[in-house]
């Protein structure tokens, strides 16, 4: 069965999951000067499947333009894809000093709220 | 002290909080036909104050355009302002039937994730 090809089941390909990317330490805003790259893991994707009745109605109201909300603080009508666990990341700075930053990278994600 | 006016302290006026609005039942997407209004409470506002080291670095990476993320699923670099408690809401439909919808309105908010 594992080798048989079949029609793909409908899955939320954009669903909440852990993603990773090589990024320059200099772009992390840590205040450490470094030319190194590190692997940064983060969470992104949709949490539509986990919506409550409140969320469904909120989405309906937002879609209908029926809710007034302050500029820049539009309410969120689904749980958020957020890290549930973190890990430390280490790198070498320009002075060849080994630096470790706790809770920098995500190691697990969940639909929260 | 309660009656004294003083120079405003810098506070997060746009912070995560409970808001309320009268909305038409017809805009709630419940499948019930009704021209009534109900009071709908929802959560909105910023959770910037609760950001972790991961969030700060994620925000820095996003700001620098250093992260690739799938269209429509940009990662969130702060906890989400979401309901932590809900309440039922009741209304009259067009047939004068009293309807109650559980968990429709928020009663408390928090910065989650």
């Amino acid at each position: 069965a594992g080798t048989r090809s079949s029609r793909a089941r409908t899955t939320d390909a954009r669903g909440c999951r852990l993603r990773s990317q090589l990024v320059p330490v200099s772009a992390l805003g840590l205040g450490h000067s470094s030319d190194e790259l590190i692997r940064f893991r983060f969470c992104s994707g949709s949490c539509r499947r986990a919506r409550s009745q409140h969320d469904l109605s909120l989405a309906s109201l937002l879609g209908a333009g029926a809710l007034r909300s302050p500029p820049g603080s539009r309410p969120i009508s689904q749980p958020c894809c957020r890290p549930t666990r973190y890990e430390a990341v280490s790198f070498m700075d320009v002075n060849s000093t080994w630096r470790t930053v706790d809770h920098l990278s995500a190691t697990a994600c969940g639909c929260l709220g | 002290a309660g009656t004294r006016s003083s120079r405003a302290r810098t506070t997060d006026a746009r912070g995560c909080r409970l808001r309320s609005q009268l909305v038409p039942v017809s805009a709630l997407g419940l499948g019930h036909s009704s021209d009534e209004l109900i009071r709908f409470r929802f959560c909105s506002g910023s959770c910037r104050r609760a950001r972790s080291q991961h969030d700060l670095s994620l925000a820095s990476l996003l700001g620098a355009g250093a992260l690739r993320s799938p269209p429509g699923s940009r990662p969130i670099s702060q906890p989400c302002c979401r309901p932590t408690r809900y309440e039922a809401v009741s209304f009259m439909d067009v047939n004068s039937t009293w309807r109650t919808v559980d968990h429709l309105s928020a009663t408390a908010c928090g910065c989650l994730g």
Epitope: - | R17, L18, S20, L22, P24, S34, D35, E36, L37, I38, R39, E87, V89, S90, F91, M92, S96, W98, T107
Partner: antibody, heavy 122, light 107 residues
Framework: EVQLVESGGDLVQPGGSLKLSCAAS????????MHWVRQASGKGLEWVGR??????????EYGASVKGRFTISRDDSKNTAYLQMNSLKIEDTAVYYC?????????????WGQGTMVTVSS | DIQMTQSPSSLSASVGDRVTITCRAS??????LNWYQQKPGKAPNLLIY???TLESGVPSRFSGSGSGTDFTLTISSLQPEDFEIYYC?????????FGQGTKVEIK
């Protein structure tokens, strides 16, 4: 647009009667309670009374100062509420507001009319 | 009847000031407390519902807090349009009652 419009305010002599109307538009109020609140010139707000919805058998309650003299009624088919005022006194002189209170675990005066002036004077 | 006592009855402040108005109930009313603003010649307008919920469309500089018998309305940074009269109101018991009002005036 959601609104309430009061009418019927007038100058009346002490001991006289007056009937105020409150018409709702832009929504249906049959599931809501209808309240009346008044405000004498330069004074604070005073709750007059309310009529509840059909589910609560259109029960009415009144403030102590008007009990036995004022009667609140409603006609849901016309989306209109009424305040019948009898045995009017000089101290009943005020702006009268009708207010919708939608159902909720905690209630508030949600939608206010613009007010209608009742003057009791000889 | 539940008595609602507001203080102060009036206050003078300047644009940009932080202002706090208090409301005390004669018995516990949980969070069955609403705040209204009234402009001259107009009906009151709901600002804060259920002690602390900001009514949509009301600026975020307004906030409410409290439970039981003691409540506060705070305006974090007074704006010119905020110089009006404010009322608290309880909906815990019939008859619903209001505070006597607080007039916020320009210093």
């Amino acid at each position: 647009e959601v609104q309430l419009v009061e009418s019927g305010g007038d100058l009346v002599q002490p001991g006289g009667s007056l009937k105020l109307s409150c018409a709702a538009s832009g929504f249906t109020f049959s599931g809501s309670a209808m309240h009346w609140v008044r405000q004498a010139s330069g004074k604070g707000l005073e709750w007059v009374g309310r009529i509840r919805n059909k589910v609560h058998r259109y029960a009415t309650e009144y403030g102590a100062s008007v009990k036995g003299r004022f009667t609140i009624s409603r006609d849901d088919s016309k989306n209109t509420a009424y305040l019948q005022m009898n045995s009017l006194k000089i101290e009943d002189t005020a702006v009268y507001y009708c207010v919708v209170v939608v159902p909720g675990s905690i209630e508030a005066f949600d939608i206010w009319g613009q007010g209608t002036m009742v003057t009791v004077s000889s | 009847d539940i008595q609602m006592t507001q203080s102060p009855s009036s206050l003078s402040a300047s644009v940009g000031d932080r202002v706090t108005i208090t409301c005390r109930a004669s018995q516990s009313i949980s969070t069955y407390l609403n705040w209204y603003q009234q402009k001259p010649g107009k009906a009151p307008n709901l600002l804060i519902y259920a002690a602390s919920t900001l009514e949509s469309g009301v600026p975020s500089r307004f906030s409410g807090s409290g439970s039981g018998t003691d409540f506060t309305l705070t305006i974090s940074s007074l704006q010119p349009e905020d110089f009006e009269i404010y009322y608290c109101q309880q909906s815990y018991n019939i008859p619903w009652t209001f505070g006597q009002g607080t007039k916020v005036e320009i210093k």
